[in-house]
């Protein structure tokens, strides 16, 4: 019915307005409504103006599409001509009464389908239904994936690519690890992946200044070391260094009036020369204190070395040896005086004898024919040496003696000349001053070592070598090497050290083979007035701790590996060091600080006497130990 109406309207329009000209009222009769008439008539006038003979106005431009007046006028009522809709976005155009309706393709909107719908922003379909990236396009959209993901066939979802399974040797010698959207070539800790060589390369952490002092790089890691010999130890962070702190303060007060006899490990502590009238006789008075059992107190001789007198200690008793043109004698007597107390000693040459007194009581009288030292040119010239010999005199002695003596003398009066300027000399030299109070024992000041050559091989023992050690210690610093065996190739196949424990105010004892800790005796309160006792036995098969303490050890298998290293070293030459290490690499042992404190060592049943050492640092006290600092009310 509608199409019939349209055809009638078209016929009327043809008759009324094309075959003849029509005014607006006549046009109203054709359309039968105002909106269409109002839309049609202005456009009709434009067509008339354009196609009137000889008339070409600017209006003609808008009617260029039509070849004649009929076409121009017929097109006016069709709202879809010319097309008002956006060509990209419309599906169809429907003509209406002075209006049109554009039907849009999916993905377009607006009256003329001129606006693209952004499907990616559709609240009812979040992100366009895409699992990763939504790309809006004119009239449409599509999903895409981030790199490292591939699109699934539903064109919406993405799947991670497992690059590691795509190419098995993707990372070369490294381990390929798939991660969302990517992959990683993983190396063990301490290694870094090299993209060029496709391999894991050792990270040189030492070149990255990881350590405060010393650094040793090894494949897959590094170890920091601190210069223990300068008093540093590794901090908790295993990187920085901190000073080895005092855990038990000692009374290190000295007095210049007290002459220390063991200032030199080998050598004379003081040398005096006397030129006196020929009537003078030899005399020496002094107070003497020691725990040492053997050593030279003083040695006096004539200028030409032909006559000499030795005052010494042997077995804790005074011994006198003398030799001159008339006689050669040796006498030992009196009570044991190496008791750590001050003993007044006097040696006086009388007319026919030499008198030795302790605490003013005569203990020895040695007969002598004639003077001890022969005067020359009316003068008695005598040289006196304290705590040692001026040269090698072993062959001249009646009975050999180890000259080293750890002791003190005070209030001396030689040749009846009083202190005669000696105090002034001593006053200037701090290391000649003696400690005010001492106890029995050996003292390691944390600045040196003592070396021994001990034969650990026992022919009668089927095990071959064995080491039985007893340590009595009273440390004053919580870290240091107490005992170490050092091979000729500068390795340390065995060491017993002290380290500050992680738990406060306690120490661990570590036993190591080279740089591996094989035993750790944990959390002991060693820094106390009381001495601590540690006893152990080692042979090629076993390490046995005889002191009942809580230990932490490595596996039996690993222990055997480490004991095999020790066994190999013990078959060669090893030197025994007390109190620290000689110049070995820092990485040779877990601990390299010097031991600071008191310590007595017994190895294979023999108490080690530091006076018998091959070498000993001068500051190590062989037979005296400073007492613990006692806090006074005003200190």
């Amino acid at each position: 019915a509608n199409s019939m109406l349209e055809e009638t309207k078209q016929g009327n329009l043809e008759r009324e307005c094309i075959e003849e000209l029509c005014n607006k009222e006549e046009a109203r009769e054709v359309f039968e409504n105002d909106p269409e008439t109002d839309y049609f008539y202005p456009k009709y006038l434009v067509c008339l103006r354009s196609f009137q003979s000889g008339l070409f106005t600017a209006a003609r431009q808008s009617t260029d599409a039509y070849p004649d007046l009929r076409s121009c006028v017929n097109a006016i009522p069709d709202q879809c001509s010319p097309l008002p809709c956006n060509e990209d976005g419309y599906m169809s155009c429907k003509d209406g009464k002075a209006s049109f309706t554009c039907t849009c393709k999916p993905g377009w909107q607006g009256e003329k389908c001129e606006f693209d719908i952004n499907e990616c922003k559709d609240p009812s379909n979040i992100n366009g239904g895409c699992s990763q990236i939504c790309d809006n396009t004119p009239g449409s959209y599509h999903c895409s994936c981030k790199s490292g993901f591939v699109m699934l066939s539903n064109k919406k979802d993405c799947k991670d690519v497992d690059e590691c399974s795509l190419k098995p040797n993707m990372c070369g010698t490294a381990v390929c690890k798939n991660i969302p959207g990517d992959f990683e070539c993983e190396c063990p800790e301490g290694y870094r992946y090299n993209l060029k060589s496709k391999s894991c390369e050792d990270v040189d952490e030492c070149s990255e200044n990881m350590c405060a002092q010393l650094c040793v790089n090894y494949p897959g890691g590094y170890t920091c070391y601190c210069d223990g010999k300068k008093g540093f130890k590794l901090a908790q962070d295993q990187k920085s260094c901190e000073a080895v702190s005092v855990c038990l303060p000692l009374n290190l007060d000295t007095k210049y009036e007290l002459l220390y006899l063991a200032e030199q490990f080998a050598g004379v502590v003081l040398y005096l020369k006397f030129r006196l009238p020929e009537i003078s006789r030899f005399s020496a008075e002094f107070d003497f204190r020691t725990y040492d059992s053997q050593g030279v107190i003083l040695y006096a001789e004539s200028i030409d070395h032909s006559a000499w007198l030795l005052i010494a200690l042997r077995g804790g008793k005074i011994e006198v040896q003398l030799k001159n043109e008339h006689t050669s004698k040796i006498t030992t007597g009196g009570d044991i005086i190496n008791n750590g107390l001050w003993n007044m000693v006097s040696v006086e040459e009388l007319e026919h004898s030499i008198s030795i007194k302790i605490a003013k009581e005569a203990v020895m009288d040695i007969n002598k024919p004639g003077p001890l030292f022969k005067p020359e040119n009316g003068l008695l010239e005598t040289k006196v040496y304290f705590a040692g010999f001026p040269r090698k005199v072993e062959s001249e002695l009646i009975k050999p003696i180890n000259p080293r003596l750890d002791g003190c003398i005070r209030s001396w009066n030689l040749m009846k000349q009083g202190a005669s300027g000696i105090k002034e000399i001593i006053q200037e030299k701090q290391n000649k001053h003696c400690l005010v109070t001492v106890e029995k024992g050996s003292y390691y000041p944390g600045s040196g070592i003592a070396e021994f050559h001990i034969d650990y091989n026992n022919g009668s023992n089927a095990e071959g070598w064995h080491i039985n050690v007893t340590l009595n210690i009273r440390p004053s610093m919580g870290t240091g090497v107490m005992l170490a065996l050092v091979s000729s190739n500068n390795t340390v196949p065995f060491a017993v050290s002290l380290v500050d424990s992680t738990s406060e105010k306690s120490q661990d004892i570590v036993i190591s083979v080279e740089n591996t800790v094989i035993y750790r005796i944990q959390a002991l309160s060693l820094c106390s007035n009381q001495r601590s006792h540690l006893e152990f036995r080692v042979n090629r098969n076993n390490l046995e701790l005889l002191t009942p303490l809580k230990i932490e050890t490595i596996s039996q298998e690993e222990l055997q590996t480490q004991l095999a290293i020790l066994d190999k070293a013990m078959k060669g030459k090893v030197a025994t060091y007390l109190g620290g290490l000689p110049d070995v690499p820092f990485s040779a042992t877990p601990v390299n600080a010097f031991y600071n404190g008191c310590m007595e060592v017994n190895i294979n049943g023999v108490e080690l006497d530091l006076d018998e050492a091959i070498s000993k640092h001068n500051d190590i006290r062989a037979h005296s130990c400073p007492s613990v600092w006692k806090k006074t009310k005003n200190s």
Partner: antibody, heavy 117, light 113 residues
Framework: QVQLQESGPGLVKPSETLSLTCTVS????????WNWIRQPPGKGLEWIGY???????DYNPSLKSRVTISVDTSKNQFSLKVTSVTAADTAVYYC???????????WGQGTLVTVSS | DIVMTQTPLSSPVTLGQPASISCRSS???????????LSWLQQRPGQPPRLLIY???NRFSGVPDRFSGSGAGTDFTLKISRVEAEDVGVYYC??????????FGGGTKVEIK
């Protein structure tokens, strides 16, 4: 949407190298595994090989010694080279996109390569 | 490599009637991730192949619902419920379980009687 277009010479002389390029448009080259497949006249489909955009490749063992597939991400293209060709290499060569579901979602129109002197 | 065998080689069908194509693999196509990567492709005369079905039974976008896939392990089937003239062509099954090594079946030709 993603479209593929093969290009390259239609005629190659025996013993020479066949070179084809596939241009990817309308999407990211990182979103699929890119494959070459061939079909000799009147015969079935034969998978040649694939490339992933970071350069990972794999080839049909029967062709491995003669085939190289490469990618140029800046141009959104991947290429096929077959060396020492013979008449047996005459075929329609297709490039195709393999999805994460391991299915060939998208195909190029194909290009006929004839090996003849 | 996995060998894919299709039967029949040719399948003449009457328009509006169903058709069935079988595909057998030389070993199980179940991947370690649990999926079975078996797909079906259609190649109309003079055209490139196009994806119909992926992962045994999933219809690809735009594929009419008269096409369906089924099967498991080593035996798979493509069914066309009512064959239309536009369905004429060669149908291929393809395994991608062994990805990146892919193999196609020999093809089955569907023609109208």
């Amino acid at each position: 949407q993603v479209q593929l277009q093969e290009s390259g010479p239609g005629l190659v002389k025996p013993s020479e190298t066949l070179s084809l390029t596939c241009t990817v448009s309308g999407g990211s080259i990182s979103n699929y595994y890119w494959n070459w497949i061939r079909q000799p006249p009147g015969k079935g489909l034969e998978w040649i090989g694939y490339i992933y955009y970071i350069g990972i490749t794999d080839y049909n063992p029967s062709l491995k010694s003669r085939v190289t597939i490469s990618v140029d991400t800046s141009k959104n293209q991947f290429s096929l080279k077959v060396t020492s060709v013979t008449a047996a290499d005459t075929a329609v060569y297709y490039c195709a996109a393999l999805s994460g579901d391991h299915a060939f979602d998208i195909w190029g129109q194909g290009t006929l390569v004839t090996v003849s002197s | 490599d996995i060998v894919m065998t299709q039967t029949p080689l040719s399948s003449p069908v009457t328009l509006g009637q169903p058709a069935s194509i079988s595909c057998r693999s030389s070993q199980s196509l179940v991947h370690s991730d649990g999926n079975t990567y078996l797909s079906w492709l259609q190649q109309r005369p003079g055209q490139p192949p196009r994806l119909l079905i992926y992962k045994i039974s999933n219809r690809f976008s735009g594929v009419p619902d008269r096409f369906s896939g089924s099967g498991a392990g080593t035996d798979f089937t493509l069914k066309i419920s009512r064959v239309e003239a536009e369905d004429v062509g060669v149908y291929y099954c393809m395994q991608a379980t062994q990805f990146p090594h892919l193999t196609f079946g020999g093809g089955t030709k569907v023609e109208i009687k």
